[in-house]
């Protein structure tokens, strides 16, 4: 004896988020009379997706005209798919009954998997700046993707990094997943212009990976090197002393001149020159009237860079001797000049 079968020909269907899923179902008989219902999941907790007989299902449309008496096609389309729609869908035939219809036969089920693109990777660096030779950690996060398989790579200036750890969560089955990766990067003095890139490849991206970047200029601090030199005599009894502040980053820098330990002048780096590697140079100079001093003068250039403890460089100015050249200005980038006479 022939009996109605419910055929769901597709064991699984894969749909991109935002698209429409077609779930196919056919009955092999018009007997017994009764409606078809679609459910997600099985058992008592199953979720009604579509009822041929009654109800409002705004996201669901039928492929065929169910008012047709001889219709055996109970396929449905579900619009605007999201990862939350993933699951196994069952097409279930009911037999007309009184007072209620009775479940007659179910299809084998169709597993709907949703392909969702990962969000743009967000790369974040350490909260505080670090100096060259230090190792810093960068994190990369991307969310909302499905299926779980994903590839993440780290690059520094185009060179692939190997020191990183990656986790995809959750470990078990889920409608969508997140990836979190931490990479360790050793800073060098040349890294002001460097970039760290996190690259995420996923089946939904069709070979065009997503990238998140972090500029090491936000992370690195290159402390300055100081050089104090005495310039040739400008005029009788006047000595020009310069403080060359070289190769620093970021620009935030305050310089204080001390004369025998006493503050002579404080200034903030303004007209700086930029080096090819992105670091800065600055020069400050002090015009000292040696005739106002009986004893030797200790001149100190004290620099506070980017809120760090001050570093200093001193120069002893002999007042007993006739002023003469003591060292030379080797900085080709001398652009700033500040004058200070001591009386």
């Amino acid at each position: 004896e022939e009996e109605l079968q419910v055929i769901q020909p597709d064991k699984s269907v894969l749909v991109a988020a935002g698209e429409t899923a077609t779930l196919r179902c056919t009955a092999t008989s018009l007997i017994p009379v009764g409606p078809i219902q679609w459910f997600r999941g099985a058992g008592p907790g199953r979720e009604l997706i579509y009822n041929q007989k009654e109800g409002h299902f705004p996201r669901v449309t039928t492929v065929s005209d169910l008012t047709k008496r001889n219709n055996m096609d109970f396929s449905i389309r579900i619009g605007n798919i999201t990862p939350a729609d993933a699951g196994t869908y069952y097409c279930v035939k009911f037999r007309k009954g009184s007072p209620d219809d009775v479940e007659f036969k179910s299809g084998a089920g169709t597993e709907l998997s949703v392909r969702a693109k990962p969000s743009a990777p967000v790369v974040s660096g350490p909260a505080a700046r670090a100096t060259p030779q230090h190792t810093v950690s960068f994190t990369c996060e991307s969310h909302g993707f499905s299926p779980r398989d994903i590839t993440l790579k780290w690059f520094k200036n185009g060179n692939e990094l190997s020191d990183f750890q990656t986790n995809v969560d959750p470990v078990g089955e889920s409608v969508s997943y997140s990836i979190h990766s931490t990479a360790k990067v050793v800073l060098t003095r040349e890294d002001v212009h460097s970039q760290v890139i996190c690259e995420v490849a996923h089946v939904t991206l069709q070979g065009d990976p997503l990238r998140g970047t972090a500029n090491l200029s936000e992370t690195i601090r290159v402390p300055p090197t100081l050089e104090v030199t005495q310039q040739p005599v400008r005029a009788e009894n006047q000595v020009n002393v310069t403080c060359q502040v070289r190769k620093f980053y970021p620009q935030r820098l305050q310089l204080t001149w001390l004369e025998n330990g006493n503050v002579s002048r404080t200034e903030t780096a303004s007209t700086v020159t930029e080096n090819k590697d992105g670091t800065y140079n600055w020069m400050s100079w002090l015009l000292v009237n040696v005739s106002a001093h009986r004893d030797d003068v200790k001149l100190t250039c004290q620099v506070e860079h980017d809120g760090q403890p001050a570093v200093s460089k001193s120069h002893d100015l002999k007042v007993s001797a006739h002023p003469k050249e003591q060292g030379s200005n080797t900085a080709a980038e001398n652009t700033g000049s500040n004058e200070r006479n001591i009386y």
Partner: antibody
Framework: QVQLQESGPGLVKPSQTLSLTCTVS??????????WSWIRQHPGKGLEWIGY???????YYNPSLKSRVTISVDTSKNQFSLKLSSVTAADTAVYYC???????????WGQGTTVTVSS | DIQMTQSPSSLSASVGDRVTITCQAS??????LNWYQQKPGKAPKLLIY???NLATGVPSRFSGSGSGTDFTFTISSLQPEDIATYYC?????????FGGGTKVEIK
Amino acid sequence: QVQLQESGPGLVKPSQTLSLTCTVSGGSISSGSPYWSWIRQHPGKGLEWIGYIYASGFTYYNPSLKSRVTISVDTSKNQFSLKLSSVTAADTAVYYCAREGYHSGMDVWGQGTTVTVSS
Amino acid sequence: DIQMTQSPSSLSASVGDRVTITCQASQDISNYLNWYQQKPGKAPKLLIYDASNLATGVPSRFSGSGSGTDFTFTISSLQPEDIATYYCQQFAYLPWTFGGGTKVEIK
């Protein structure tokens, strides 16, 4: 009104694949919810339903032929087609395409095309 | 598959006669039954759908009845143009199946 026209070779060699096309005119193959069927009739015999395809792209084939049959639709050409593989002399018949419309019953038929399987 | 048994396989009747053909299904098919007419060298033509409904453009001398397993097709007054073979077809169960046909001739 809708008309159907079968086309394809009248002679097919044994073990080869029989390929027929049904062109729908006077209406769109994708409008409404019709079943597009293939039926054949052996010389001097009755009618045998081969299978159908419908709106969702779902096909159902007569189990007696299932392993050898493929029915497909090309909406851009307003055509549906039949492929029957590994033919033998027993597949010699007149092949009809037909539409089952809103009401039950195949209300529109092609005129039929004779296919002979012979070497 | 549902077996459809048609009888008689052929009959001869005079113009104006009432002609009756029966079709029996191997199991209950409710009223999911169609009747077709096929003239020599032509494609079949739908006459009756859902066991008793007359298809568009079909003369009223043709009628159908029955439900379950037993069905009847009647030509109330045979006309010369009715010479043809008549087939029943069930569509309650896949695969759809046809009866063996009844050839109607004029005496």
